[in-house]
């Protein structure tokens, strides 16, 4: 996706000081999807627009972060700003859909990530590099920290795979891309096996 961060920042920077305060207050009470935590009040109230944007993306990922921002803006009566986010969401959706087309054949036979789960748990050593690549776009801040908290590479990979069932094709493609960059020979080996 990637566009969401810029879109959220533009929206938040286009709020007056009072509107940004109101946005934060509403963010503290807005109904969240199951499985998502709330940004701590103390930290939230101190944030400027750039910090808040990054926090929204790391806590809720780009797609839901964008949706949440839209919801709060609409609740504040700021339709115009919300509409612009809606446009970004639709554009990003089209891009994501287009990007996932080549992967349809792999979806039928099982994605690389699912097919090689055991081997990846056993053989990926540079887990932190993989996590950094997924941080904010696929993994929430909490998930990122949870994986990093594990001590061995295998445990980290097991923890990472515990989040995979809730991922879509784009998320799995992102993991595959990260693995290709960090462990190209491992990926090549597994693709040929």
């Amino acid at each position: 996706m990637g566009r969401a961060r810029d879109a959220i920042l533009d929206a938040l920077e286009n709020l007056s000081g009072d509107e940004l305060k109101k946005f934060k207050m509403k963010l503290l009470t807005v109904q969240l999807r199951e499985g998502y935590g709330r940004i701590p009040r103390g930290a939230l109230l101190q944030m400027d627009a750039i910090d808040l944007t990054d926090k929204l993306v790391s806590y809720y990922l780009e797609s839901y972060g964008l949706e949440l921002t839209m919801t709060v803006l609409r609740d504040m009566g700021l339709q115009e700003l919300a509409e612009q986010l809606q446009t970004t969401k639709e554009e990003s959706g089209a891009v994501a859909a287009a990007a996932s087309v080549p992967a349809q054949s792999t979806a039928r036979t099982g994605h690389f990530v699912d097919q090689h789960r055991q081997a990846l748990i056993a053989r990926v050593t540079e887990v932190d590099g993989v996590l950094d690549a997924l941080h904010g776009s696929v993994l929430t801040e909490g998930q990122y920290q949870a994986v990093r908290a594990e001590t061995t590479s295998q445990d980290k990979m097991r923890k990472l795979f515990s989040f995979v069932p809730s991922w879509n094709l784009t998320c799995k493609d992102s993991l595959l891309q990260a693995l290709k960059e960090i462990h190209p020979y491992l990926v090549m080996d597994l693709e040929q096996s």
């Epitope: 879109a7 533009d10 920077e13 286009n14 509107e19 904010g136």
Partner: antibody, heavy 112, light 106 residues
Framework: QVQLQQSGAELARPGASVKLSCKAS????????ISWVKQRTGQGLEWIGK????????YYDEKFKGKATLTADKPSTTAYMELRSLTSEDSAVYFC?????WGQGTTLTVSS | QIVLTQSPVIMSASPGEKVTITCSAS?????MYWFQQKPGTSPKFWIY???NLASGVPARFSGSGSGTSYSLTISRMEAEDAATYYC?????????FGGGTKLEIK
């Protein structure tokens, strides 16, 4: 399609002021921020600052504070940058840009 | 402010060659943006949020990195890729650009 149309080339005297314009079309003017970027001949890009038209929030690189003033006129969907106390160092091409679209640039020449 | 240092400053590559341009930040940034500029024209938005290609950018381009280290890679150099490339951070005000990398074709 977002378009940014910048004003024409300017020739100014040292010590004078000049106001460059950037007319936006094809998107909701108040929903984007507009950045201004300087490029001297054969040199790299320098970020001057940014204005968010709806809120009026502005951010500047310290180097350009006191030199550049960014404003925006919502009814005409136009952003402006005023440069004051001009010197030869201000001779450059100035671009306006939104998230991912750029204007064609305005060439400013400061000469006596 | 965050200083971005690009390397190399100038380089030339043969058609078909792999090219990597790096951008190092003086402190950690969340994303990197890349622009392509050819002489006498406005910069073009090229890669956004570290690794996403802007509309119309050929698939031979890719972007990667995190923290303070980012890169733009061309898998197989083509004549039309000869240009100057700039990185930009939008994580902290003032936003800043790298000094640019001029890429020439051999």
């Amino acid at each position: 399609q977002v378009q940014l149309q910048q004003s024409g080339a300017e020739l100014a005297r040292p010590g004078a002021s000049v106001k460059l314009s950037c007319k936006a079309s094809g998107h909701t003017f108040t929903s984007y921020g507009i950045s201004w970027v300087k490029q001297r001949t054969g040199q790299g890009l320098e970020w001057i600052g940014k204005i968010y038209p709806r809120s009026g929030n502005t951010y500047y690189d310290e180097k350009f504070k006191g030199k550049a003033t960014l404003t925006a006129d919502k009814p005409s969907t136009t952003a402006y940058m005023e440069l004051r106390s001009l010197t030869s160092e201000d001779s450059a091409v100035y671009f306006c840009a939104t998230r991912d679209y750029w204007g064609q640039g305005t060439t400013l020449t400061v000469s006596s | 402010q965050i200083v971005l240092t690009q390397s190399p400053v100038i380089m030339s590559a043969s058609p078909g060659e792999k090219v990597t341009i790096t951008c190092s930040a003086s402190s950690s940034v969340s994303y990197m943006y890349w622009f392509q500029q050819k002489p006498g024209t406005s910069p073009k938005f090229w890669i956004y949020s570290t690794s996403n290609l802007a509309s119309g950018v050929p698939a031979r381009f890719s972007g990667s990195g995190s923290g303070t280290s980012y890169s733009l890679t061309i898998s197989r150099m083509e004549a039309e890729d000869a240009a100057t490339y700039y990185c930009q951070q939008r994580s902290r005000y003032p936003w800043t650009f790298g000094g640019g990398t001029k890429l020439e074709i051999k």
